[in-house]
């Protein structure tokens, strides 16, 4: 077929028609509709919303919309036996108890089924003991405590502030340090921006507000009972003792009013430096235990949550491609929320809904995309990316052969300052070109492009005149597509000014106060930032599904591979003597990167020149582009993390949210000076260099002329 046979209008006009159809007022209306009651995974309310979305996507004009269900392990508090933490005196009497629920926001006092704050998948238990304050509970915080301050957390209950890293990593670190319980709290230093009122008068966290969240360490496994395979009707489930990633000690989150009561009595060691002090009027003493007058008092946790196999529902919509129906571009975001989901996820789900409506409108006018577009409303993201992972496990053979790209669509906003994009290097040029065509919504940038405001506000640290684009980490539904299957992926949202706002995430994240009103009153009253995010996400999907040649530039991968090789080499060179002793060389990696660069350059030249009217050659070149991301997958996975298979990127072993480059080498080098067997440790570094060099070389060869 000719390149444009799929459409009844020119490609440029198609994109314009699609973008012009997106309306801020619709996104606002959809957000309101999605946020009036809680939609916790595994509940009837979230099932009803799945059916509503299925029905509306059908009305919008998609070819088919199906529910895909799975029975996965979820976690809920006990309704009659609430979780809380006490300070107990020497007689065991509870002299202070933490709150049982958050004070509901105005207008929501009579809403039922608001799940109280809890740490999902915490085991049951009632440990009691002395408290140790561990700052953010990062790897480096425990190094400071154990190595520098000689403080032993074994048998202690640790209290850690939220922020900086994924909460599951905090719990894992506490477990490894021997703690018998973990209390997580939100410090105003991280969740209260100066000069802003707390909700309902502003977007800051009130003292009674608490962040919910799962505390798993799944490393990409999906449902803890069925790693690698879908949790379907005939699934074989592991016993709970063999489940993947479950914490072994009780964990519970609290707000800063309650944290004040626990921390104000802390004794023992003073904080090691100012980076350990938050904004509460407490000494931030590390402990262990309470100070003089209160030294006989202890902390006791009361955790009664249960893990239950529960049915979840994804909504999968299909818009069949006219020319290449066997090539899939996927737009997915989750639907389940902790409570109302005003930002997470419904600001994203409302944008997806409007994107589906716009595509449906074009389809009703006779247009079809060149490639198939799949739309997904994922369930149980908050419980460990379960819905997306189970669906990808069920459809892995199709996806690895047909998956062109995955665009994630969780929260559209985490601020209203500028754009934030994390994606594969293959998409850099697509994002640059698209944002140059879109109008900036920012004040002071009227009539300017989104690219211009984004570049001004968030400049690239390496390349002047270009915006920052970050590595993909995890903590969201792109994980299985990118890290396990090697499908080119990207995400975009509006964010805060990271220079001036040092708090982690947005203050009301995963609290009861994440409401429609939070967005409508404080973040985006005109829904212009939501509209911009819809244009970016939708525009990316449109280009990926409709451009004749896939909008991937392999030369950008070459550039970052060199940067990442330089970075990991410089880390290794902090140990020059050992590198010499154990004959550690990065020559093979640098050689592979050089080969990749040369081959990518030649491929790009051929891409300019080939006969695009020849459908076989076009398909061949597009397949080389599509399969390039796949070529970075190692079927054996990373050490002890079999579902993280991408050799160039993986979630950091110390923070699931962050991406790490050459993660196999990085982890082999991490803290290598403390390893008991240096010969073995440096041997593993050499092995990881070998794996990385081989993978880069093998990927390069997929771009060579085929014969």
């Amino acid at each position: 077929k000719s390149s444009n046979e799929a459409t009844n209008i020119t490609p440029k006009h198609n994109m314009k028609a699609f973008l012009d159809e997106l309306k801020a007022e619709n996104i606002k209306k959809f957000l309101y509709n999605f946020t009036q009651i809680p939609h916790l995974a595994g509940t009837e309310q979230n099932f009803q919303l799945a059916k509503q979305i299925q029905s509306q996507w059908k009305e919008f004009g998609l070819d088919s919309v199906e529910l895909a269900h799975y029975d996965v392990l979820l976690s809920y508090p006990n309704k009659t036996h609430p979780n809380y933490i006490s300070i107990i005196n020497e007689d065991g009497n509870e002299i202070f108890n933490t709150s049982l629920f958050e004070p509901p926001p105005p207008g929501y006092e009579n809403v039922s089924d608001i799940v109280p704050p809890f740490s999902a998948f915490s085991p049951q238990g009632m440990p009691e003991g002395d408290l140790v304050y561990v700052n953010y509970a990062r790897t480096e915080d425990f190094f400071k405590l154990e190595r520098d301050m000689k403080i032993n957390c074994s048998g202690k209950i640790v209290i850690a502030r939220y922020g900086k890293v994924f909460r599951g990593n905090k719990v894992k670190n506490a477990q490894l340090a021997g703690a018998k319980g973990v209390i997580l709290y939100s410090d105003p230093a991280d969740y209260f921006a100066p000069g802003v009122k707390s909700y309902p008068d502003g977007w800051n966290l009130p003292g009674g507000g608490v962040q919910r969240g799962n505390i798993l360490n799944l490393n990409g496994a999906g449902d803890p009972l069925t790693p690698g395979y879908p949790a379907n009707e005939y699934a074989y489930r592991r016993g709970i003792a063999e489940a993947v990633g479950l914490p072994s000690i009780p964990v519970h989150p609290i707000g800063y009013y309650d944290a004040q009561k626990l921390l104000e009595k802390m004794g023992g060691s003073a904080p090691p430096d100012s980076s350990w002090r938050g904004s509460l009027k407490v000494p931030y003493n590390v402990g262990p235990g309470f100070t003089g007058n209160f030294s006989t008092q202890k902390v006791k946790m009361h955790i009664h949550s249960t893990n239950e196999v529960t049915r979840i529902y994804n909504v999968i919509g299909t818009l069949r491609g006219a020319v290449e129906p066997d090539r899939y571009v996927i737009l997915g975001g989750h639907r389940d929320s902790w409570v109302f989901g005003g930002i997470d996820p419904q600001s994203g789900a409302a944008v997806v809904h409007e994107i589906v409506r716009s595509f449906g409108t074009l389809k009703k006018e006779g247009w079809r995309p060149r490639r198939t577009i799949l739309f997904a409303s994922w369930d149980a993201e908050e419980f460990g990316l379960l819905g997306s992972t189970e669906w990808a496990e069920e459809n892995s053979r199709l996806l690895q052969e047909r998956g062109v790209a995955y665009i994630n669509a969780d929260s559209s906003i985490e601020g209203n300052y500028t754009l934030r994009v994390d994606c594969t290097p293959l998409m850099y040029s697509l994002v640059h070109n698209l944002t140059k065509e879109l109008k900036s919504p920012d004040e002071g940038f009227e009539g300017k492009s989104l690219y211009e405001s984004w570049t001004k506000k968030s400049p690239s640290p390496e390349f002047s005149g270009m915006p920052r684009i970050s590595k993909l980490g995890s903590g969201n539904d792109f994980e299985v597509f990118f890290q396990r299957l090697g499908i080119a992926s990207g995400r975009a949202r509006y964010t805060k000014n990271w220079e001036t706002n040092k708090f982690s995430g947005y203050p009301l994240y995963h609290s009861v106060y994440e409401t429609y009103e939070l967005v409508e009153k404080f973040y985006d009253p005109m829904f212009k930032y939501h509209l911009t995010v819809a244009q970016v996400r939708g525009g990316m999907v449109f280009e990926l599904a409709n451009s004749i040649v896939l909008p991937f530039d392999c030369r950008d991968y070459a550039v970052v591979l060199r940067k990442y090789a330089d970075k990991i080499y410089s880390i290794s060179m902090k140990h020059p003597q050992e590198m010499k002793t154990y004959s550690v060389s990065f020559d093979s990696l640098f050689s592979a990167v050089k080969n990749f660069t040369e081959i990518a350059s030649k491929f790009s030249e051929r891409l300019q020149d080939f006969d695009k009217s020849n459908p076989i050659v076009l398909r061949m070149m597009n397949d080389q582009l599509m399969f390039l991301e796949r070529a970075f997958i190692d079927p054996l996975g990373l050490p002890d993390r079999p579902f993280y298979r991408h050799v160039i990127y993986a979630p950091s072993s110390h923070n699931k949210y962050a991406g790490e480059s050459f993660p196999g080498i990085y982890d082999a080098l991490f803290d290598i000076e403390s390893k008991v067997d240096p010969s073995k440790a440096w041997g593993e570094v050499k092995r990881q260099i070998y794996v990385a060099a081989f993978t880069v070389q093998a990927a390069a060869e997929t771009l060579s002329e085929v014969a």
Epitope: S99, L100, P103, E109, P206
Partner: nanobody, 123 residues
Framework: EVQLLESGGGVVQPGRSLRLSCAAS????????MNWVRQAPGKGLDWVAF????????YYADSVKGRFTISRDNSKNTLYLQMNSLRPEDTAVYYC????????????????WGQGTMVTVSS
């Protein structure tokens, strides 16, 4: 209109019991800590008891500890004070008072008061 209305006061013999109620209207009781405060004839105000918004913590003045129990029913928007083993020195006008801070874990300043209910303990 935002208001608190106390009831249940009366004359009672020493050693007997009484239960005071305080009905809130015009605002949701569920978000606020609540207090009972009393004023004996010719004396100043004395704080009696406090309960957090969620009922997880209760604090009492030493003079009533072990005898009085503060409780609440958020679904009924009502605060209670169960007074057992009453003594003549418990004679006072009892006021309920709303804590000013949403979600406070300890008593703070009060911003809404009831009109009070008189309790007389006399033989």
């Amino acid at each position: 209109e935002v208001q608190l209305l106390e009831s249940g006061g009366g004359v009672v013999q020493p050693g007997r019991s009484l239960r005071l109620s305080c009905a809130a209207s015009g605002f949701p009781l569920i978000s606020y800590g609540m207090n009972w405060v009393r004023q004996a004839p010719g004396k100043g105000l004395d704080w009696v008891a406090f309960i957090t918004y969620d009922g997880s913590n209760r604090y009492y003045a030493d003079s009533v500890k072990g005898r009085f129990t503060i409780s609440r029913d958020n679904s009924k928007n009502t605060l209670y004070l169960q007074m057992n083993s009453l003594r003549p020195e418990d004679t006072a006008v009892y006021y309920c008072a709303k804590d000013r801070i949403v979600g406070a874990r300890v008593p703070d300043a009060y911003d809404i008061w009831g009109q009070g209910t008189m309790v007389t303990v006399s033989s």
